[in-house]
């Protein structure tokens, strides 16, 4: 990737990622420098007859760093702080080629939950207030609520009225998604409203 347009690479928290390096064809490489946020990560001197010299200069990521045969950077056990700008400089006798990358770390979504704050009105209509959440949600998580294939809400929250006298059994499903994973959780309107009805009759007695 040219230095003008960094290659954006997605990594998944806790997993591994490779930043691919392309060599200038037919040219002998003198050395390669890898940088992270403009700070040196590693310095590599290739040798034709023996193993390359690899000097890891960033102790923070050092143990998790590896290089392929073509000196592409491999980073394992990804952490959120690995997010940022990476550059590789390949120096030959005649030129220096720069490759730029932007690494973004995404979380696999975990632990989807739905909380319910519902009320029963005197006409026996049940108003459902549902809130969906996942662990460590960020701005890249999309939430939506669906029922019978229709999207009822595009937010973590859903407010809907359900009348047991005219409505058949209805499931509401929250779907949480990001670029690398999706989770869903369904709740039954009938079950939630029955629970509210029990509470309602208990308080009336």
């Amino acid at each position: 990737q040219s230095s003008l347009t960094p290659l954006m690479v997605n990594g998944i928290l806790g997993e591994s990622v490779t930043l691919p390096l392309e060599f200038p064809a037919g040219e002998k490489v003198n050395f390669i420098t890898w940088l992270f946020n403009e700070t040196s990560l590693a310095f590599i001197v290739p040798h034709e007859t023996k193993s390359p010299e690899i000097h890891v200069t960033n102790p923070k990521q050092g143990k998790r760093l590896n290089f392929t045969q073509s000196y592409s950077l491999q980073l394992s056990n990804l952490k959120m702080e690995d997010t940022g700008s990476y550059r590789a400089q390949i120096s030959t006798k005649t030129s220096a080629k720069l490759s730029s990358y932007t690494l973004r770390i995404l979380r696999q979504l975990r632990n989807i939950q739905v909380t319910n704050h519902s009320q029963l009105f005197q006409n026996m209509t049940c108003e459902l207030h549902l809130t969906c959440s996942v662990e460590d949600a960020d701005d890249n998580v999309s939430f939506r609520w669906e029922a019978l294939g229709n999207t009822l809400s595009s937010q973590p929250n859903l407010t809907v009225s359900w009348d047991p006298r005219i409505s058949s059994e209805q499931d509401y499903t929250c779907i949480a998604e990001n670029a690398v994973s999706n989770l869903s959780f369904s709740v039954s309107a009938q079950k939630l409203c029955e629970d509210v009805k029990i509470q309602y009759t208990d308080t009336k007695m």
């Epitope: 954006m8 701005d139 890249n140 999309s142 809400s153 595009s154 937010q155 998604e177």
Partner: antibody
Framework: QVQLVQSGSELKKPGASVKVSCKAS????????MNWVRQAPGQGLEWMGW????????RYADDFKGRFVFSLDTSVSTAYLQISSLKAEDTAVYYC???????????WGQGTTVTVSS | QIVLSQSPATLSLSPGERATMSCRAS?????MHWYQQKPGQAPRPWIY???NLASGVPARFSGSGSGTDYTLTISSLEPEDFAVYYC?????????FGGGTKVEIK
Amino acid sequence: QVQLVQSGSELKKPGASVKVSCKASGYTFTNYGMNWVRQAPGQGLEWMGWINTYSGEPRYADDFKGRFVFSLDTSVSTAYLQISSLKAEDTAVYYCARDYGRWYFDVWGQGTTVTVSS
Amino acid sequence: QIVLSQSPATLSLSPGERATMSCRASSSVSHMHWYQQKPGQAPRPWIYATSNLASGVPARFSGSGSGTDYTLTISSLEPEDFAVYYCQQWSSTPRTFGGGTKVEIK
């Protein structure tokens, strides 16, 4: 039917403020996020950010942090975009757009033209 | 942010011809949405989640793709199809649009 109706065109002087409204009808306003999109003359579409219509929490794209404010009046199912300290480069058509999920904008307002000129 | 590059910028074709436009993302995205815009009008939803046609969109339109490369195809252009088409990604904030492909009459 589901629709978004925006307020009319505005002509403002540099340094002034403007408030654009977007009135929703035909659906439960607090169930769908509202997005704002800018289109400068002869240019493409720029996502400005969105507001959670249930919680009222706004989220702004980096280029729209500071002078741009999203707000709501849920009692009249209306979203607002306020721009302060207007500059000539704010001259554009501003659209509100409903998020149907996965940031797919299934319903758009007709657009409000804001012209900033001395 | 994820940059979406649309190509070509302009597509000059005659009615009845096939139109193919591309949207390339600077990073892998899960799905792509497409919108149609005509002069003086608001954008209209056209294709959502890569390949699903929005309500009222004719079957001559189709969408495909995955990862970083997405395509909108019009099998046989009709006069009403001449417009600007924008792609938009949802995988990462900020939600970004491509620069648009203008389909004009040759």
